[in-house]
Each structure stands twice: as structure tokens, then as C-alpha cells.
Interface confidence: low
């Protein structure tokens, strides 16, 4: 679909409001350190230019690609070299290399201050004074901290953010109305960012084929009544949408996502019976709803898979004729029958099937060779089932905080070279799998747990990639996307690790801990726990538990003291000495 002016085409398709929001997100995701005002100025300039192109598509520069237009605009930033260092070298390149260069400089862990939420009255005043600027700041702050956030979905979050302020700033108790909504948006936003980060990593590190395989499996579970042609069409379109968003082509991505939602709703009769409610919603809500829709019921009387994929004499012929299509059909047929399996497990089964066919179709008697291929699936299915069973039992026994601590110890022993903040963040998120998934019945536990763990372990992988410190992490992250979790699960204590020198400063605490929220206090304690394990990797669970219990009692005691700071100083020294003795440091 060739257009004389791409920028005019997207402006007309998306409308001015969405166009401006998406350009702001794109710029903030590229130049994460730039001040808000600078970005707004750039966005306004691009918007004015787009309007001239809408008026006359033949006007000067209107025929340029969006990458060229946006890249040229970003490269006008005066402080590029001093703020971003070598990223400024991108501006010497031509498209498409320049855009690739900007993408490579996206920072998953930018050095930005923590967002501190102002008082509710302050926020409501700001909202009423200038609603447009207030909402733009939200987009800007989220986008720069999450450079791979799914842009059309961020528009949906912004819409909910606006709705929360519109409703709650008029309420009798503003805080009671607003704060739970903002907490929910924050938590959902972090989860959404992490899920999208995995999609982008899948595309960028493992290629389109890996993403398509994931999509075939997931969509086949979700839409088991849809025929393979339909699932394949959706996979092709979804891959295009995510390739665009992960590549910084946010206008195209949002436009294509809207088209995909439209197609799905127009064809819901041949896709899923669960789409009716979603399809009655406005665009942003509709797209979000479709992405989260529950699995449709499986068609009755699906025949055995063995007939087409094991017993048939044509297996090798069909495989040779169109390998990826045949494997895609296998994945589709297996996934639609197994909503109880995780997507990564389904992909492991498909990989095993592919490996078997590659070997057997070259053998003297192929059928004899692959006849028992389904038997090879049994241990692959049982491994995550057993792991989830054990960990859910541990979670139910310990509760979330202590379960997180058990994982902190486990993962610090596996990969002690990883930075303490990363270990704390990742282990806390791994620990959330308990409350998120263990409540589910057996049939829903595995897809919930293992696919969530894939998202969390990807966080570890992208953070580690920025500053690699552990060969074991690199190996698990890069060898196989679908085997990341089994790879990390299989890691034992790193015997090569040289324990960290003891530093009393690491275990010195002050009265400010008393004013922290429960969550922040937990993080402080968990940070200390990781440091303890790094000092004493051979410490037993019992030793660590004793020290942590003493630590909790020390914090509680000093927070109740009249002279808190003196208590922390004096009791802290005693605690450090006692801990050193208990751990033999």
C-alpha cells in the first residue's frame, strides 16, 4: 500500500491525539535522558510538519520515511554528545543503520531517579491545571523507563490513568479512590512491560521464526476452534505488529494493531466464541481485551494426534514438502489440545519432534525410527509439572516473603556474580509466581507459572546483557529461548565463586528504615540476605534463617526505641558481630 507521504498517511489513520502520543513515546524510548520539555518541543515540530504533509503530500520532505524524519529530528538535539556519549555517533550514519544504532543504545536499566508519587491533592491540582501536560508527562516517564513498552498498550494505560484522575479528583476521599487505582496501573504496567520485553527479545535475539512459533502455540491454545489457516494469518499479522513496535516503528505498529483487532472482530465467528464482549469496546480497550481473552473451549472429538504425526506413512513426505508448515501444524494441533501446557513446553515438544524427524527421515526405516517419538515427550512434560508442584507446596508453607527469600538464596548461590539489586528484583518477581499461579487448579498452573517465569528470567537476561558478569547466565540466556527456565533450574551452587570480602558498611542500618513502606523494608532485608550469601555461599538454610530472624527483631526493636539512631548504631554492631560468629565469617 504505497503512500506518497508516509507521515501524512499515519497522521490521518491515527488522528492527531494518538499521533502526538506515539511520537512522544518513540522519542522518549530512544532519548531516555532528555528533559520532558525538549521532547514536547520535538513532538510539536513533527506534528506541525505532519499537518503540512496532510494538506499537501507533495510538499518538501513529505516523501521521506518516518525513520529519516524522526532520526533527523532526534539528531537536532544539541546536548546529544554530552548526554548520551557514543549514541551521538548514530547521527553520522544513514538509514536504516541510524535507526538500528538508536535501537542498540536503548537502555533497559536507565540511570533515572525513582518515580516518587506526590500527594494526592498535588496530583489533582496538576491534573486540573493542565490535563494535557499531565498526561504527556505520564507517557514520557513510563516510556523512558521502559524503552520497549508496547506503545499502543501504553495509550490504553494513559486512558485509564486519565479516567482515574477524572473520577477520583472529584471524590470525597480522593486518596482512597485514587491510590489503589494507581497501584494497580503501576503493577499492571510493570507486568505489561516485562511481557513485551520478552517478545522483543524473542524477535531480536532468536528471530522471527522463534516468535512465530511462540505465537502459533499461544494463539492455538486461545483459539482452538480456529482452523490452521486462520491461526497462521493471525500469527503473520501479530508478528508484523510486534516487529514494528520492537523496531521503534510505533505509528505503523499502532495502525496495524488496530487493523488486526478490526479483522479479529469481523471474523470472530471463525476465531473464538469468547470475543463478543471485547469486540463491543472502543479501540484501545478492544485491543487490550483481545490480547487477554480467555481460551475458547476445545472442539469436541478432536482425533488423536498420532494418526497424522506418527502413524501416517506420509510423515516424512509431508515434512520434507514444507518443513515449517508441517511443524506449524503439529504445534497448532498439539497446542489446541493442551491449554494445560505452558507455551514453552509446547515449543520444547515441537523441537523434539523436529529433531526426531530430521534424524529419522534420513534413516533406513523412518517409521520404525519415529514410531516412539511421543514417548520422548513424557519426561519433558513431567519436569515442569513436578517443579511447579514442589514450589507451590513450598510457597503454601512459607508465604510470599519467605518464599522469595528461599529463591533469593537459591539464585544467589547459582549466580553470585550478578549484581545484588538485580538478584533482589528478579528473585522477588520469581517469588510472585506463588501468589499468581499456585491458587489455580492443576490444569491452569503450568501455563501460568512457566510462561510467567519465562518473562521474569528474560528480565535477568536483558539486565545481565548490559553488564555481563556470569558465563552461566550468558549460557542459559543465549543457548535456547524455550530452555532458559530448565537451564537455570539445573544450575547448582557455583563452586568457582570466590566469596565477597566482608564489609560492615553493607550491614549498617539507620532509622530511615522505620519510615519505609512494608515493601521497601522487605527489599532492604532481602538486599542484606543476598549480601550475606555472597559473603558465605556455603551457609546453610538454618544459619541464614537464624541471622534473618535476628535482623528482623533488631529492626523491630530499634524502630520502637525512643532514640532510634543510637539504637541502630549500637545494636547494629552487636548484630553484625553475632551474625559473623553464627556464619563463621
Amino acid at each position: 500500500d504505497a503512500h506518497k507521504s508516509e507521515v501524512a498517511h499515519r497522521f490521518k489513520d491515527l488522528g492527531e491525539e494518538n499521533f502526538k502520543a506515539l511520537v512522544l513515546i518513540a522519542f522518549a524510548q530512544y532519548l531516555q535522558q532528555c528533559p520532558f520539555e525538549d521532547h514536547v518541543k520535538l513532538v510539536n515540530e513533527v506534528t506541525e510538519f505532519a499537518k503540512t504533509c496532510v494538506a499537501d503530500e507533495s510538499a518538501e520532505n513529505c516523501d521521506k520515511s518516518l525513520h529519516t524524519l524522526f532520526g533527523d529530528k532526534l539528531c537536532t538535539v544539541a546536548t546529544l554528545r554530552e548526554t548520551y556519549g557514543e549514541m551521538a555517533d548514530c547521527c553520522a550514519k544513514q538509514e536504516p543503520e541510524r535507526n538500528e544504532c538508536f535501537l542498540q543504545h536503548k537502555d533497559d536499566n536507565p540511570n533515572l531517579p525513582r518515580l516518587v508519587r506526590p500527594e494526592v491533592d498535588v496530583m489533582c491540582t496538576a491534573f486540573h491545571d493542565n490535563e494535557e501536560t499531565f498526561l504527556k508527562k505520564y507517557l514520557y516517564e513510563i516510556a523512558r523507563r521502559h524503552p520497549y513498552f508496547y506503545a499502543p498498550e501504553l495509550l490504553f494505560f494513559a486512558k485509564r490513568y486519565k479516567a482515574a484522575f477524572t473520577e477520583c479528583c472529584q471524590a470525597a476521599d480522593k486518596a482512597a479512590c485514587l491510590l489503589p487505582k494507581l497501584d494497580e496501573l503501576r503493577d499492571e504496567g510493570k507486568a505489561s512491560s516485562a511481557k513485551q520485553r520478552l517478545k522483543c527479545a524473542s524477535l531480536q535475539k532468536f528471530g522471527e521464526r522463534a516468535f512465530k512459533a511462540w505465537a502459533v502455540a499461544r494463539l492455538s491454545q486461545r483459539f482452538p476452534k480456529a482452523e490452521f489457516a486462520e491461526v497462521s494469518k493471525l500469527v503473520t499479522d501479530l508478528t508484523k505488529v510486534h516487529t514494528e513496535c520492537c523496531h521503534g516503528d510505533l505509528l505503523e505498529c499502532a495502525d496495524d494493531r488496530a487493523d488486526l483487532a478490526k479483522y479479529i472482530c469481523e471474523n470472530q465467528d471463525s476465531i473464538s466464541s469468547k470475543l463478543k464482549e471485547c469486540c463491543e469496546k472502543p479501540l484501545l480497550e478492544k485491543s487490550h481485551c483481545i490480547a487477554e481473552v480467555e481460551n475458547d473451549e476445545m472442539p469436541a472429538d478432536l482425533p488423536s494426534l498420532a494418526a497424522d504425526f506418527v502413524e501416517s506413512k506420509d510423515v516424512c513426505k509431508n515434512y520434507a514438502e514444507a518443513k515449517d508448515v508441517f511443524l506449524g501444524m503439529f504445534l497448532y494441533e498439539y497446542a489446541r489440545r493442551h491449554p494445560d501446557y505452558s507455551v514453552v513446553l509446547l515449543l520444547r515438544l515441537a523441537k523434539t519432534y523436529e529433531t526426531t524427524l530430521e534424524k529419522c527421515c534420513a534413516a533406513a526405516d523412518p517409521h520404525e525410527c519415529y514410531a516412539k517419538v511421543f514417548d520422548e515427550f513424557k519426561p519433558l512434560v513431567e519436569e515442569p509439572q513436578n517443579l511447579i508442584k514442589q514450589n507451590c507446596e513450598l510457597f503454601e508453607q512459607l508465604g510470599e516473603y519467605k518464599f522469595q527469600n528461599a529463591l533469593l538464596v537459591r539464585y544467589t548461590k547459582k549466580v553470585p556474580q550478578v549484581s545484588t539489586p538485580t538478584l533482589v528484583e528478579v528473585s522477588r518477581n520469581l517469588g510472585k509466581v506463588g501468589s499468581k499461579c499456585c491458587k489455580h487448579p492443576e490444569a491452569k498452573r503450568m501455563p501460568c507459572a512457566e510462561d510467567y517465569l519465562s518473562v521474569v528470567l528474560n528480565q535477568l537476561c536483558v539486565l545481565h546483557e548490559k553488564t555481563p558478569v556470569s558465563d552461566r547466565v550468558t549460557k542459559c540466556c543465549t543457548e535456547s529461548l524455550v530452555n532458559r527456565r530448565p537451564c537455570f533450574s539445573a544450575l547448582e551452587v557455583d563452586e568457582t565463586y570466590v566469596p565477597k570480602e566482608f564489609n560492615a558498611e553493607t550491614f549498617t542500618f539507620h532509622a530511615d528504615i522505620c519510615t519505609l513502606s512494608e515493601k521497601e523494608r522487605q527489599i532492604k532485608k532481602q538486599t542484606a540476605l543476598v549480601e550475606l550469601v555472597k559473603h558465605k555461599p556455603k551457609a546453610t538454610k538454618e544459619q541464614l534463617k537464624a541471622v534473618m530472624d535476628d535482623f528482623a527483631a533488631f529492626v523491630e526493636k530499634c524502630c520502637k526505641a525512643d532514640d532510634k539512631e543510637t539504637c541502630f548504631a549500637e545494636e547494629g554492631k552487636k548484630l553484625v558481630a553475632a551474625s559473623q560468629a553464627a556464619l563463621g565469617l
Epitope: 482452523e227 489457516a229 497462521s232 471463525s270 501444524m329
Partner: nanobody, 124 residues
């Protein structure tokens, strides 16, 4: 390697009907999206119609909607194009095509296998 053989072409008067058939061999017919394309003398090849593996979806070019019907019989490895209310501008060489990529495609470059074509002439 899939072989496609078209039949059923011929000369017909405006307003008349024809039924084209395309027999496939050498591949697993039920795994392919099947399509019909046509090429008039001195013109580019253009999409006419396509049908999904299990016949759930059918696609038509705007110029033939309501007049042409595509169908398939997987047990016979055959795809059909029923053409009614034929017009002189329908005169062309009609090709049957098979796509192993199972998304919807109206572009000829997405199809992997092609027949030799069958000639349809609409003339009084």
C-alpha cells in the same frame, strides 16, 4: 512437488456460466490454501479468488464478487471455480495456485505452485 492441472475453460457467451476445476497431485492437498488467478492479454496477472484448507474462508476480488464461487473437495484433491454471469472482461487465462503459507494472500508471489492455465473466452 505439487502438480496442478486446470480444466473446464472454453468459449461462452456473455451472461453464460463455466465451472473450472483444478486437480492437485504430489502434495498433501488439505494443507494448502488454494487460489485462482487470471491474466488477460497484455495485462498483469490478477487475483480472482482463494479458499482456506477447510473451506472456512473464501476470498474474492471485487470484480467477481457475487458472480464467482470457489469451493474445494479435499477427498478428491480438487478445487473448483464456478463462474456465473460471465462478462467479456472476464476473458483471460485462468491459473490455479497453491500456497503452503497459510495466511491470506492475494499477491501472486506468495503462491508456491502454479498450473499451466485454462483459457476462458467470453464473446458473442
Amino acid at each position: 512437488e505439487v502438480q496442478l492441472v486446470e480444466s473446464g475453460g472454453g468459449v461462452v457467451q456473455p451472461g453464460g456460466s463455466l465451472r473450472l476445476s483444478c486437480a492437485a497431485s504430489g502434495g498433501t492437498f488439505s494443507t494448502y490454501v488454494m487460489g485462482w488467478f487470471r491474466q488477460a492479454p497484455g495485462k498483469e496477472r490478477e487475483f480472482v479468488s482463494a479458499i482456506s484448507q477447510n473451506s472456512i474462508h473464501t476470498y474474492y476480488a471485487d470484480s467477481v464478487k457475487g458472480r464467482f464461487t470457489i469451493s474445494r473437495d479435499n477427498s478428491k484433491n480438487t478445487v473448483y471455480l464456478q463462474m456465473n454471469s460471465l462478462r467479456p472482461e472476464d476473458t483471460a487465462l485462468y491459473y490455479c495456485a497453491a500456497s503452503r503459507f497459510t495466511s491470506w494472500y492475494t499477491a501472486d508471489y506468495e503462491y508456491d505452485y502454479w498450473g499451466q492455465g485454462t483459457l476462458v473466452t467470453v464473446s458473442s
